[in-house]
Interface confidence: medium
């Protein structure tokens, strides 16, 4: 349905508060280096303009597209060329090329300082002094660091952030109340950002067919009682929502997400018995709740799939008639029966089934050719099952920190060309799969682990695309979305890699090490471990363990010394020499 003024339409649909929040997020995700005040000024100008269009949709410029309006506004920033370099060239383009240009310049790893958390009293004062500015600052700081963060979900995070301060700044022990809530929001926010980044990568790099396949599998697991038609409708709508958000169309995305939540709540009976408690909540919470809702129970008497997808003589006829629909139905049927499989495994099975039909439907006896297709699934199913089993055993044996170290060594040997900070970040996150998934019952382990790993490996792919250094990484990242994790798992020690020259500076430490938090200490040690492996890729586990144990002892000793800096200066070179000898 067309509207005379798109900006007026969205302002009226979303309301002023959400409109302003979403425009701030959009601008912050595009111009990640701009100061907060600049963005607030732009947002206020856009909001005032939107209000004039609400009052009179025929007013000047009100008929322009949102991309035109927002792009024109972004291009008024005076320091565009100095701050962003070639991104300023986007402003010479016409829509839709200009928006595409801005999208291409989004930076997944912007050169921004890490967010420092002030003292609780300082934060509470700022919150009370100007709550609106305080919350806008939160949206701005998160959005500029996470340029693909799911915008309507970020509004939900901001609402929780506000609620945490409103409650805790009145508590007797403000810090005890507030800090765990902020930690939880930070961790959930990072996870949400990474999950959304995979959705956007799926859409942008592999197309909407790939995203729709993912959505069919996931929604069929969540809503196994829903009919295929219902799942198809939800998939179509969800694809539109995510296409819009990933494309920077945040107002449309938020509006369509609200419509989808409304539809789901009005049609609970034909979707899932689990939606009821979500549907009683206010909008932002409702949408979040629906996205995270647990799987419904599987219908009791689902027949075997073999009858329709293997035994039927009409398989090739049906496949030929509408390939994607037939494969979609196969995926739906398989996924609703297997909440215990990862989405990526289900997609691999659908790909294998498709490949078999492509081959067999051209054969002399198609039925004979595809009769054993389900048997071919067995190795595909067993591979992630074994991987999860082995890695959970390793995690339980080592604990999280040492499990991360094992992964650091494993991945540095596979792709030693990748930058050390990236290897540390990715391996630390890969290692978190243990605590996240290994405690779950068997039936939930694989979907938790493999789908989480897909999210983490996407982060590696996104960072690597910005600065490509390894053909092996490029190959695993670009050849097949569903086979990324098996592709990385299959990589061996890179025999062609020329070991990095030893640099004593890399292994020189100072007294500031002692004041670091436990997490920061771990990162320092893990950075050293990656550098060691890059220097000696063929070092054994035992050799590396010996060096790392010595390192921990050396740091502990010097942090207990009266003159810490002198200790580091004296003991450091000894540690380096001993390490070189141990690895020789």
């Amino acid at each position: 349905d067309t509207h005379k003024s798109e900006v007026a339409h969205r302002f009226k649909d979303l309301g002023e508060e959400h409109f302003k929040g979403l425009v701030l997020v959009a601008f912050s995700q595009y111009l990640q280096q701009c100061p907060f005040e600049e963005h607030v000024k732009l947002v206020n100008e856009v909001t005032e303009f939107a209000k004039t269009c609400v009052a009179d949709e025929s007013a000047e410029n009100c008929d322009k597209s949102l991309h035109t309006l927002f792009g024109d506004k972004l291009c008024t920033v005076a320091t565009l060329r100095e701050t962003y370099g070639e991104m300023a060239d986007c402003c010479a383009k016409q829509e839709p090329e200009r928006n595409e240009c801005f999208l291409q310049h989004k930076d997944d790893n912007p050169n921004l300082p890490p967010l420092v958390r002030p003292e609780v009293d300082v934060m509470c004062t700022a919150f009370h002094d100007n709550e609106a500015t305080f919350l806008k600052k939160y949206l701005y700081e998160v959005a500029r660091r996470h340029p693909y963060f799911y915008a309507p979900e970020l509004l939900f995070f901001a609402a929780r952030y506000k609620a945490a301060f409103a409650e805790c700044c009145q508590a007797a022990d403000k810090a005890a109340c507030l800090l765990p809530k902020l930690d939880e929001l930070r961790d959930e926010g990072k996870a949400s950002s990474a999950k959304q980044r995979l959705k956007c990568a799926s859409l942008q790099k592999f197309g909407d067919r790939a995203f729709k396949a993912w959505a069919v599998a996931r929604l069929s697991q969540k809503f196994p009682k829903a009919e295929f038609a219902e799942v198809s409708k939800l998939v179509t709508d969800l694809t539109k929502v995510h296409t819009e958000c990933c494309h920077g169309d945040l107002l449309e995305c938020a509006d369509d997400r609200a419509d989808l939540a409304k539809y789901m709540c009005e049609n609970q009976d034909s979707i899932s018995s689990k939606l009821k408690e979500c549907c009683d909540k206010p909008l932002l919470e409702k949408s979040h709740c629906l996205a995270e809702v647990e799987n419904d129970e599987m219908p009791a008497d689902l027949p075997s799939l073999a009858a329709d997808y293997v035994e039927s003589k009409d398989v090739c006829k049906n496949y030929a008639e509408a390939k994607d629909v037939f494969l979609g139905m196969f995926l739906y049927e398989y996924a609703r029966r297997h909440p215990d499989y990862s989405v990526m495994l289900l997609l691999r099975l659908a790909k294998a089934y498709e490949a078999t039909l492509e081959k067999c439907c051209a054969a002399a006896d198609p039925h004979e050719c595809y009769a054993k297709v389900f048997d071919e699934f067995q190795p595909l199913v067993e591979e992630p099952q074994n991987l999860v089993k082995q890695n959970c055993e390793l995690f339980e044996q080592l604990g999280e920190y040492k499990f991360q170290n094992a992964l650091l060594v494993r991945y540095t040997k596979k792709v030693p060309q990748v930058s050390t900070p990236t290897l540390v970040e990715v391996s630390r996150n890969l290692g978190k799969v243990g605590a996240k998934c290994c405690k779950l019952p068997e039936a939930k382990r694989m979907p938790c682990a493999e789908d989480y790993l897909s999210v983490v490996l996407n982060r590696l792919c996104v960072l690597h695309e910005k600065t490509p250094v390894s053909e092996k990484v490029t190959k695993c990242c670009t050849e097949s979305l569903v086979n990324r994790r098996p592709c990385f798992s299959a990589l061996e020690l890179d025999e062609a890699y020329v070991p990095k020259a030893f640099n004593a500076e890399t292994f020189t430490f100072h007294a500031d090490m002692c004041t670091l938090s436990e997490k920061e200490k771990q990162v320092k040690k893990q950075t050293a471990l990656v550098e060691l492996v890059k220097h000696k890729p063929k070092a054994t586990k035992e050799q590396l363990k010996g060096v790392m144990d010595n390192f921990a002892a050396f740091v502990e000793k010097c942090c207990k010394a009266d003159d810490k800096e002198a200790c580091f200066a004296e003991e450091g070179p000894k540690f380096v020499a001993a390490s070189q000898a141990a690895l020789a």
Partner: nanobody
Framework: QLQVVESGGGLVQAGGSLRLSCAAS????????MGWFRQAPEKEREFVAG?????????DYADSVEGRFTISRDNAKNTAYLQMNNLKPEDTAVYYC????????????????????WGHGTQVTVSS
């Protein structure tokens, strides 16, 4: 929500022909079985014809219309058709198009409960 709209009904003499159309609002229409039902005054609604979820697949007819009626579908147009030849006065009824999601297989059922979405019907009157 999937919408179903019938058209093509009207008044025709016995022995004449009519072609009913049933348009569905969604592309995923291709995945459903389609059925035509009819209801004469003071009578129960009854199955007339069905076609399974792909154009090349199964069709099914009530004994009373077998050989006279033909069901077909055009997936590209999200539309199903009922070609009715050699019409008889007893064919007079409101004709309803219905879409089924019964899976797996999407075979055309004869049972009304197999069909989830219904049109409002189109009147067919056959005069003698």
């Amino acid at each position: 929500q999937l919408q179903v709209v019938e058209s093509g009904g009207g008044l025709v003499q016995a022995g004449g022909s009519l072609r009913l159309s049933c348009a569905a609002s969604e592309r995923t229409f291709v995945a459903y079985a389609m059925g035509w039902f009819r209801q004469a005054p003071e009578k129960e609604r009854e199955f007339v014809a069905g076609i399974s979820w792909f154009a090349g697949a199964t069709t099914d007819y009530a004994d009373s219309v077998e050989g006279r009626f033909t069901i077909s579908r055009d997936n590209a147009k999200n539309t199903a058709y009922l070609q009715m030849n050699n019409l008889k006065p007893e064919d007079t009824a409101v004709y309803y198009c219905a879409i089924s999601h019964q899976l797996p297989g999407g075979r055309p059922g004869r049972d009304m409960d197999s069909y989830s979405y219904w049109g409002h019907g189109t009147q067919v009157t056959v005069s003698s």
